[in-house]
C-alpha cells in the first residue's frame, strides 16, 4: 500500500533570465527511493538514480543543474520555460509517486513564490 505523500514547491514564478529551484520531498513512507525523474510535460529533463547518480538530458545540459539534493535548478529562464514540471519518485516497494510544480516565467520583476502544497 502506498502511504507516502509528495510535498512540492507548488505554483511558483520567477523572472526571465533568472534561475529557480524545483524541489520535491517524499514523506510518510519508509520506501527506498531508487530513482527520481524530472520531466517538463513529456520531456525528460534529468534523472537521479540512487546507484548511478545524475543524468541531465543533452538538450538541457547548459541550463539545468542537479540539486540541491534530489531537486533541480533551472537557469537562464525564458518565457518558454513556463509550464508544468513533474518529479517522479520511483520507490521500492511502494511504486511510483508523482509531484507537480507549475512554473510561470515573468517578463517583469514581480515574480513571487507560491504556497507549498501536497499531493498524496
Amino acid at each position: 500500500m502506498m502511504t507516502g505523500t509528495i510535498e512540492t514547491t507548488g505554483n511558483i514564478s520567477a523572472e526571465k533570465g533568472g534561475s529557480i529551484i524545483l524541489q520535491c520531498h517524499l514523506s510518510s513512507t519508509t520506501a527506498q527511493v531508487t530513482q527520481v525523474n524530472w520531466e517538463q510535460q513529456d520531456q525528460l529533463l534529468a534523472i537521479c538514480n540512487a546507484d548511478l547518480g545524475w543524468h541531465i538530458s543533452p538538450s538541457f545540459k547548459d541550463r539545468v543543474a542537479p540539486g540541491p539534493g534530489l531537486g533541480l535548478t533551472l537557469q537562464s529562464l525564458t518565457v518558454n520555460d513556463t509550464g508544468e514540471y513533474f518529479c517522479i519518485y520511483h520507490t521500492y516497494p511502494d511504486g511510483t509517486y508523482t509531484g507537480r510544480i507549475f512554473l510561470e516565467v515573468l517578463e517583469s520583476s514581480v515574480a513571487e513564490h507560491g504556497a507549498r502544497f501536497q499531493i498524496p
Epitope: 525523474n37 520531466e39 513529456d42 538514480n49 548511478l52 513533474f86 520511483h90 511510483t96
Partner: antibody, heavy 121, light 108 residues
C-alpha cells in the same frame, strides 16, 4: 559495426560461481552503459543489472543483489558478469546488451549472442 | 515493480496478414518509456521500437508501435516469413526494468 561477443557455455555445480565475459567492438566503449539480462529455458527475459561506462557505478535488480557482480576492463573493452551461489534455477542464457543512450536509459540496443549457463549436480 | 502483461500468448497468422500485439502495464508508464523486441529461436533479442513508437535503426516500416499510459500495441502491417518470432515489450520508466512474458507469432 557494433558487436558484443560473449564467452562460451558453462556447466557449474550448485553453490559454485560463474563469470561470463562480453567483449565490445565497433564503438567507444567508455561512452555507454551495459546491461545484463537472462532467459531461463522456454521463459521470458529478466533484467539483472547495469554497469556504467567507467565501471565505477552499478545498479542491480533487487532479486540479484548480493549475488551478482558486474565489472569492466577498459583496456580490453570487456564487461564481466559474475553470479555466485548458483542454484538450478540459475540455468539460463545470459546476455549482455549495450544501452541505446549515453546514460542508463534502459533501452537495450545491441545484444551479445548469449552464454548458456547450466547449473547441475 | 511494474508488471507487463502481453496478449495473446500465441498469435497464429499467415504471411501477408496484419498482426496486432498488446502489452498492458500494471501502472502508468509515463512519457511512453516502452520498447519492443523481437526474438527468433536460438538468437538474441533485437530492438524494434523504443519510446512506444520510434523505430530502431534498420527496422522496416511495417513495424509500428503505439499507445501510452498502461496500454501499448505493436502492429506488423503485413507479415513477412522472417517476422514469425516471439515479441517482448519492456518498460524502462521505473527500475527495475521489466519485460512482458512475450507473444509468439506463428505461421497458421
Amino acid at each position: 559495426q557494433v558487436q558484443l561477443v560473449q564467452s562460451g557455455a558453462e556447466v557449474k555445480k550448485p553453490g559454485a560461481s560463474v563469470k561470463v565475459s562480453c567483449k565490445a567492438s565497433g564503438y567507444t566503449f567508455t561512452s555507454y552503459y551495459m546491461h545484463w539480462v537472462r532467459q531461463a529455458p522456454g521463459q521470458g527475459l529478466e533484467w539483472m543489472g547495469v554497469i556504467g561506462p567507467s565501471g565505477a557505478s552499478t545498479s542491480y535488480a533487487q532479486k540479484f543483489q548480493g549475488r551478482v557482480t558486474l565489472t569492466r576492463d577498459t583496456s580490453t573493452s570487456t564487461v564481466y558478469m559474475e553470479l555466485s551461489s548458483l542454484r538450478s534455477e540459475d540455468t539460463a542464457v545470459y546476455y549482455c546488451a549495450r544501452d541505446h543512450s549515453d546514460y542508463w536509459s534502459g533501452i537495450m540496443e545491441v545484444w551479445g549472442q548469449g552464454t548458456m549457463v547450466t547449473v547441475s549436480s | 515493480e511494474i508488471v507487463l502483461t502481453q496478449s495473446p500468448g500465441t498469435l497464429s497468422l499467415s504471411p501477408g496478414e496484419r498482426a496486432t500485439l498488446s502489452c498492458r502495464a500494471s501502472q502508468s508508464v509515463r512519457s511512453s518509456y516502452l520498447a519492443w523486441y523481437q526474438q527468433k529461436p536460438g538468437q538474441a533479442p533485437r530492438l524494434l521500437i523504443y519510446g512506444a513508437s520510434s523505430r530502431a535503426t534498420g527496422i522496416p516500416d511495417r513495424f509500428s508501435g503505439s499507445g501510452s499510459g498502461t496500454d501499448f500495441t505493436l502492429t506488423i502491417s503485413r507479415l513477412e516469413p522472417e517476422d514469425f518470432a516471439v515479441y517482448y515489450c519492456q518498460q524502462y520508466f521505473s527500475p527495475p526494468w521489466t519485460f512482458g512474458g512475450g507473444t509468439k507469432v506463428e505461421i497458421k
